[in-house]
């Protein structure tokens, strides 16, 4: 029961986490700039991984995708890659974990197979969460290092001057969504790995057992001792015999024709 609950909770937490990672990746507010009060209008600028937007004091908002890969910080490409890898791994993990759920019965799937699938999905969630946390952290670090512009960086361009507009950076909402979502996915993955331990059949090392039939009518049935999972009603794993079974330590040795005096 505890394993099913842990597995189910891990799945739900990971599901929420991955939904959050997807949301963060799509959000426009990764970084927000309160631009200097433009003489024409107060301008509020914010950027995402895929496009940047401007909101004027009038309320007018416009967003445009980045014109070209050139002129984009290399780190932005790395963040995009990390977030996409996180989403892909998380999505595969979700797919695998659905089939691994103990409460869902698919054909005659062994507990060991479900345990393996649970572990696989758990590892995928952990890596997915780490990718998201890493991506968001790299972006945050990029903001801290690149956006401290005490003076506008001026250089000569064709036909005049071009300068980077002086800004005061702030972390956008997407960063916080990403950090929380990555954390949840990570926690969900850990829970799945913990659940896997409970699902896995116990490798019990039984002593070798020799059977002595007390009567001619008693036949030995193979597979009498199977390892128990330790969960649920163990109907199949009952001893075949109550009597007649002794460990090798208890077996009495009887004289035979090969015994020498």
């Amino acid at each position: 029961m505890a394993v099913t609950a842990c597995q189910g909770l891990g799945f739900v937490v990971s599901l929420i986490g991955i939904a959050g990672i997807i949301a963060a990746t799509c959000m426009d507010q990764w970084s927000t700039q309160d631009l200097y009060n433009n003489p024409v209008t107060a301008v509020f600028n914010y950027q995402g991984l895929w496009r940047s937007c401007v909101r004027e004091s009038s309320g007018f908002t416009e967003c445009r995708g980045y014109f070209t890969l050139l002129g984009l910080p290399a780190m932005l490409q790395a963040v995009r890659a990390l977030m996409i890898v996180g989403i892909v791994l998380g999505a595969i993990g979700l797919l695998v974990s659905i089939f691994a759920l103990k409460c869902i019965r698919i054909g005659s799937m062994e507990d060991s197979a479900k345990a393996n699938m649970t572990l696989t999905s758990g590892i995928m969630f952990i890596v997915s969460g780490l990718c998201a946390i890493a991506g968001v952290s790299v972006f945050a670090n990029m903001l801290v290092t690149n956006f401290w512009m005490s003076t506008a960086n001026m250089y000569t361009g064709m036909g005049g001057m071009v300068q980077t507009v002086q800004t005061r950076y702030t972390f956008g909402a997407a960063l916080f969504v990403g950090w929380v979502a990555g954390g949840l996915t990570l926690i969900g993955g850990v829970m799945m790995c913990i659940a896997c331990r409970g699902l896995a059949p116990e490798e019990t090392n039984y002593k070798a057992v020799s059977y002595h039939a007390s009567g001619h009518s008693v036949a030995y049935k193979p597979g009498g001792f199977k390892a128990s999972t330790g969960f649920g009603s163990n109907t199949k794993n009952k001893k075949i015999y109550d009597g007649g079974a002794r460990t090798e330590d208890e077996v009495q040795s009887y004289p035979s024709k090969h015994d020498y005096v």
């Epitope: 209008t41 496009r51 980045y66 980077t164 507009v165 800004t167």
Partner: nanobody, 120 residues
Framework: QVQLVESGGGLVQPGGSLRLSCAAS????????MAWYRQAPGKQREFVSG???????NYADSVKGRFTISRDFAKNTVDLQMNSLKPEDTAVYYC??????????????WGQGTLVTVSS
Amino acid sequence: QVQLVESGGGLVQPGGSLRLSCAASGVDISSDVMAWYRQAPGKQREFVSGLTRGGSINYADSVKGRFTISRDFAKNTVDLQMNSLKPEDTAVYYCNAEIYTGTFYPRSYWGQGTLVTVSS
């Protein structure tokens, strides 16, 4: 490469009119903010007039009622119609385009400037 080229400057008598034009290449004329600035000899560059993609228009107090800013999407230009010119309007007029969308780092582009001299 973004290029802003101003034209239309020259010598004009006080009370006269002049139309400045800023041709933008490599940039959408509906850039987030398009503006005109001027710099008189020995003075700092000051804002004259500007418009935004959202339609907000603003003028410096010293030119209100005399100057009109407009944009021509067909020609990809931003124009500044200057009427009732005064000697204190003498300056080098610069076209400015500020781009916040479509670029990760907000950028400000400047033209080379065109000289306007108001003198009798």
